[in-house]
Each structure stands twice: as C-alpha cells, then as structure tokens.
C-alpha cells in the first residue's frame, strides 16, 4: 500500500509567441482546480476508461481576475498535493491524465460553472520510494509543470511497496535469514514467506502463504500472462496454458469497495455501488458535495447540500457514469481486429493498430520485424514492408547502436523547439501547431486536423498527444 503524490508547479502560457488569452476576466473571475486520473500499465487507454489506480481532485485555487491588457501570467494554483492512495502493489508503469478545470465565479444562475481548460496525458515508468519525477507538458498554448512520486506506507517498502519492514528487535542485527531493510537500515525485513513458487517478478504477498498477482499476470503462482482475447467466459476457461484468467477468486473477493460500498462483478472487472456521500472507483472519496464539483465533462450537479446527502450528476449527451466521467462507449463492439485500439472520434471510429498490422480495422498482417534486433533497448516498428527501430533515449541509427542526441534529428515539426528531457524529448510548438511533435495544425475555428484523437477529447479541446 502507498500513495501517489502529484504536485502542480505552474500552469500558464507556454514558451514562444501566441500567448493564450487569460481564462478569467474582470466580468468573470475564476479559479483553477485539477483532476488526476491514474491507470496501471502502459496501455494507451481511452481518456474515459476507469481510473483503475485511482483519481483525485485538488482544492480550488485562489480567485483570479485578469488585469486588462496584461498577458496571461502563470495562474494562481491550489495549495497542497493531489494524493491518490493505492491499496495493493505499485505497478511500476502507469498512465496518467491531468485535467485543468476552470470554475467561473460570475453571476451564473444555479451556481458556478465548470469547464475543462486543458488535458494532458502520458505513460510513465516510476519506482516507488524514489525522488520526485518532474515533467513539463503542453496542451495547446498552455504549459503545465508538475512532479510526482509514489511513496510506500509503512511497513511497506521497495520499488513496488511489496516488501515489509519491522523495527529491529535487537539493536545490533536482524534475525537469522533476515536482511536490513534498505533504505531503512535501522529496520529489518519482516519474515514474510509467500506461497512456494510464487513468481518473484509478477507476484507478491501481504500475508504469509499468499500469492497475489501484479496487473497482467494470473494463475496460482502468477506465472501466466493475462490475455482476454481467447477467453470464453468472463473469468476465462480453466486451462492455465491459454493465458486467460483462471476460475477462482473473483474481482469482488475481499470486497474492494470501501466505506460500505457494495461490489458487483462486471465482464472486465468490478463496480462499486457507493453509499451516500462517497464516490470513486472504490468509494474511497468521501464527503463530496456539489460545491466540490464532482461532475465532469460539463455534467450538472443537483442536490448534495451537505456531505451526508447524495448528489446526482446529470450528464450531457455522450457521457455517463455517476460523475459523467465515462464517454458512451461505441467501441464496445470491438471493431478493431488483432488487438487494435479503438478510438471514438465522435464523428467516426478509428483503429490504432498494433505493430505488424494495418488497414482500417487492422485486418492486414505485416511481418517486417521477423529476426530483426534493435540494440540498447530499442523496439522494432513494423510497417510498409520495411522495419525500423524506435530507439531508447540517447541512442539512434538504424539499429540503435549509435549514441544520439534526441533532438539531433529535429523531430519537432513546423518550427517547434526541441528540449532534451529525462523522460524523452519535449517539443515547444510554434503558434498554430500542436501534438507531441508539433505535427498537427490547429484550425482557426479551434478544431484540429488530427488523424486519431483519443476518445473523450472533443476536437478543439486543448490537449497533448504522446
């Protein structure tokens, strides 16, 4: 168990000309707040898919009124950290969405109005217990600077918060067979023995004799990779060799719903029905009223005058969920073949194909990487009858054998400025362009010519693609 912490350092105009207009005015003062959504793994999940690792909402920032004629400065931010507790092991790789919301404080009928100002997303690798990781992301003309870390809650330690430490019983040394609990040298590893044969890479235990699996692994010893494509039932067939989830403990076992929530199984996972005053994937967020702005995507909040009374979100067309956090899923028919990612663009469905597949529905099989190796952690990318290596940061060349400056290839299009950054390269786009490599022109009407915007992001939303 532990907590993911997010610190927002600044939200304001990005570098370069074309500063955005201030989101607040003398007639309509406003304040900012932030929402973070975390998902395990590196999957390119749609923006509205559940925040399976958790979500958090910041406090409201100070009220801000634009000074007439002044450029938009860095906007005043809420105090404190956004904290997302996690109950199980920290997954090590995760996806995030950070949304910047504007609360307008003018004379709106029915209270304040909320609108989404910017949304950034990314996929990161992060070990628990380390120092703050820092990031700069751009959404249209806005720039968001933030840092994050994962902390283990005692007695858990380690990069996944799965090792347990206890204070030493003797002042000088640990008991037989037990190591000092680095980095807590004055503590010792607790004598916790998992089920015999439990995979050290993919399994962990919180009780002796137990074997619990990290995301993507299953089986009694967590040695079987999960693949839902060949499963015949919600839990999958009984054969452990298929890589399907084996019958046994269900997602509701042990009731993951906190605060008296009731759990019901869904084909993919579970769903919590929360008592009054609680919400979140596991009913872990408490004391929420309409004043906290729990309805996303323009949902209208009704009721909930005090923390003990329920609120209801009336969602706009295209959204659903108790907090209007889910877009109506047109991809549920799974139109993309061969593991392709379905993207609902609003006006159309689009398939983003896995490496080695192509076509409108990923129906064409390519095999360009067979027998090819990319050095230094590079990955082979198939397509168009030829292979190329996508190289890790710091390497280049056809097979990633050459040391490289990530900015040397001038990856930022349309005059964008390139910055070498510890998590990759970052492009600061020239006015009128957006995207991870500044490859997409922004049309004057605010829509963009994106070939494949993630679902849940309407054209015209400030956004960043990774």
């Amino acid at each position: 168990a532990g907590v993911f912490e997010l610190q927002i350092h600044s939200f304001g105009p990005g570098p370069g000309p074309g500063a955005p207009r201030s989101p607040c005015s003398a007639r309509l003062p406003c304040r900012l707040f932030f929402r973070v959504c975390l998902k395990p793994g590196l999957s390119e999940e749609a923006a509205e898919s559940p925040c399976a690792l958790g979500a958090a909402l910041s406090a409201r920032g100070p009220v801000y009124t634009e000074q007439p004629g002044a450029p938009a400065p860095d906007l005043p931010l809420p105090d404190g950290l956004l904290q997302v507790p996690f109950r199980d092991a920290w997954p090590g790789t995760f996806s995030f969405i950070i949304e910047t919301w504007r609360e307008e404080l003018g004379d709106q009928i029915g209270g304040p109005a909320w609108s989404l100002l910017a949304r950034v997303a990314g996929r990161r690798r992060l070990a628990a217990g380390g120092p703050w990781a820092r990031d700069i992301q751009r959404a249209g003309a806005w720039e968001l600077r933030f840092s994050y870390r994962a902390r283990c809650e005692p007695p858990a330690v380690g990069t996944a918060c799965t090792r347990l430490c206890r204070p030493r019983s003797a002042p000088s040394r640990c008991g037989p067979g037990l190591r000092p609990c680095a980095p807590l040298e004055d503590e010792c590893e607790a004598p916790l023995v998992c089920r015999a044969g439990c995979s050290p890479e993919h399994g962990f235990c919180e009780q002796p004799g137990e074997c619990r699996c990290l995301e993507g692994w299953t089986g009694p010893l967590c040695t079987v990779p999960v693949s839902t494509s060949s499963c015949l039932s919600p839990r999958g067939p009984s054969s452990a060799t298929t890589g399907c989830l084996v019958p046994g403990p269900g997602p509701c076992d042990g009731n993951p719903c906190a605060n008296g929530g009731s759990c019901s199984e869904t084909p993919r996972s579970f769903e919590c029905t929360c008592p009054r005053g609680f919400y979140g994937l596991r009913c872990e967020v408490s004391g929420v009223t309409c004043a906290d702005g729990p309805c996303f995507n323009g949902g209208l909040c009704v009721g909930g005058a005090d923390p003990d009374s329920a609120y209801i979100c009336h969602c706009p067309p295209g959204f659903q969920g108790s907090n209007c956090e889910k877009r109506v899923d047109r991809c549920s028919l799974q139109p993309c073949r061969n593991g392709g990612l379905c993207l609902d663009l609003g006006h159309a469905l689009r398939c983003r194909c896995r490496a080695g597949f192509a076509g409108p529905r990923c129906e064409h099989d390519l095999d360009d990487c067979a027998g090819r190796a990319c050095a230094n952690g590079g990955t082979c990318v198939e397509g168009g009858g030829a292979h190329r290596c996508s190289c890790a940061l710091g390497f280049g060349g056809r097979d990633c054998r050459e040391r490289a400056d990530p900015c040397a290839a001038r990856p930022c299009a349309h005059g964008g400025r390139c910055y070498a950054h510890f998590s990759g390269l970052v492009c600061a786009c020239a006015p009128g362009y957006m995207g991870a490599r500044c490859e997409f022109p922004v049309h004057p009407d605010g829509a963009s010519a994106l070939p494949a915007a993630p679902p849940g992001l309407r054209p015209g939303d400030p956004q960043r693609y990774l």
């Epitope: 350092h9 120092p131 703050w132």
Partner: antibody, heavy 121, light 107 residues
Framework: QVQLVQSGAEVKKPGASVKVSCKAS????????MHWVRQAPGQGLEWMGW????????SYAQRFLGRVTMTRDTSINTVHMELSRLGSDDTAVYYC??????????????WGQGTLVTVSS | DIQMTQSPSSLSASVGDRVTITCRAS??????LGWYQQKPGKAPKRLIY???SLQSGVPSKFSGSGSGTEFTLTISSLQPEDFATYYC?????????FGQGTKVEIK
C-alpha cells in the same frame, strides 16, 4: 548527518577511462537525485549530469553524451561516474552533489569532498 | 540550454563593505536559482536556494533576491572569511547550468 565520501585521486593516460565513486550515508539513499559536477584547474563549475538512485535513470549534459556513464549500487549506497576517452582537458576535480528534495528541480545541498583526476601521458 | 551570466567576474572590496553580485539568465527561470560559495581546495557550499531562502547555518549577512531573469546576491558587511569565489546555479531546467563565477578579493 548527511555525508558524501568520494574515492581517491586518479592519474590516467589519454584515451583511458576513469571511474569515480561516491558513497552516501545519513539519509535515505534512494530518495534523492545525485549529480556530478566538475571543475578544471582555475576554472568554474561545470554540471555533468544526474542519476536517480532508486530507478537508475540518468540525464547527461549534452557535451558528455556518449562518454559519461552514471550507475548506482543500492546495496552499498554508492553512485559511480565513469568517463571514457579521456583527454588532457578532462583534468579536473570531480564532485558528487546531492540534490535537495524540493519537488521541482532542486539545487545541491550536500557535496562530496571532490576527486582529482589527472590526465597525462 | 539556459545560459547564466554572472557579473562582475571579479571584484576587490574591503572588510565591512556591502557587496552585490548579479546573475542574469538567458530566459525566465522563475525563482529557481541557488548561490554557492567556494574557497580554494574546498567543495562549494550552498548559501541561498530558491533565489532568496537562506540555507540553514549560513549567516544572515548573506541575502538573495530576484525572479525571472535578474538575480542578486548581497553580502551586507564583508568579513575576512567571505573572500572566496561565488557561483549562481539555475535549477529551473533538468539541464543545470552555473554562472562563470565571481571572485571576491581583498582590496
């Protein structure tokens, strides 16, 4: 109290490599970035790069890319900096420095005593 | 990369003088600037962090100010132990850069 103790002075020939170590104590080693800074005789301070001791991730100054490698050994709370293809202009005192725990990029609150590396034929 | 320009490169002053050293960044760095003192044969020592915060244990005669691109380190009353070289460091960016240094000598 926080201490950073560096390995001893080295004399190397041009074209060789040198590996300098920095042993940390008095704090949670994996919780802070460690940086390397060098100073040629009579010159100013030059930042070389950092390592995250928890994950092993690194970031290097542009001019050292391809020549510098920073590693860590969490079992002995030590970071290492290896510089290859040495030239006479690499003669310098090499410092390890701990970055403070501010949540944005921090400055350096504790420094090692320095390791003199002399490159001479 | 962000360039840091320190001025003057050297100065002569007497004990009791008020001394000001300036550091200019090539682009805005908010308040992400530190000041260091280094004496011959010794490692640098942090005096100021976040532009104006005094490092614990450092005497209050040292002060820092500024934000954005212009920063100053002030020694209110120079003492014999303050004759040293002073460096600024920007930490707004992942790629840190130092100023070229200011040597404070006895007049």
């Amino acid at each position: 109290q926080v201490q950073l103790v560096q390995s001893g002075a080295e004399v190397k020939k041009p074209g060789a490599s040198v590996k300098v170590s920095c042993k940390a104590s008095g704090y949670t080693f994996t919780g802070y970035y460690m940086h390397w800074v060098r100073q040629a005789p009579g010159q100013g301070l030059e930042w070389m790069g950092w390592i995250n001791p928890n994950s092993g991730d690194t970031s290097y100054a542009q001019r050292f890319l391809g020549r510098v490698t920073m590693t860590r050994d969490t079992s002995i709370n030590t970071v290492h900096m290896e510089l290859s293809r040495l030239g006479s202009d690499d003669t310098a005192v090499y410092y390890c420095a701990r970055e403070d725990d501010s949540s944005w990029y921090g400055s350096f609150d504790y420094w090692g005593q320095g390791t003199l590396v002399t490159v001479s034929s | 990369d962000i360039q840091m320009t320190q001025s003057p490169s050297s100065l002569s002053a007497s004990v009791g003088d008020r001394v000001t050293i300036t550091c200019r960044a090539s682009q805005g760095i908010r308040n992400y600037l530190g000041w260091y003192q280094q004496k011959p044969g010794k490692a640098p020592k942090r005096l100021i962090y976040a532009a104006s915060s005094l490092q614990s244990g450092v005497p209050s005669k040292f002060s820092g100010s500024g934000s954005g691109t212009e920063f100053t380190l002030t020694i209110s009353s120079l003492q014999p132990e303050d004759f040293a070289t002073y460096y600024c460091l920007q930490h707004d960016s992942d790629l840190r850069t130092f100023g070229q240094g200011t040597k404070v000598e006895i007049k």
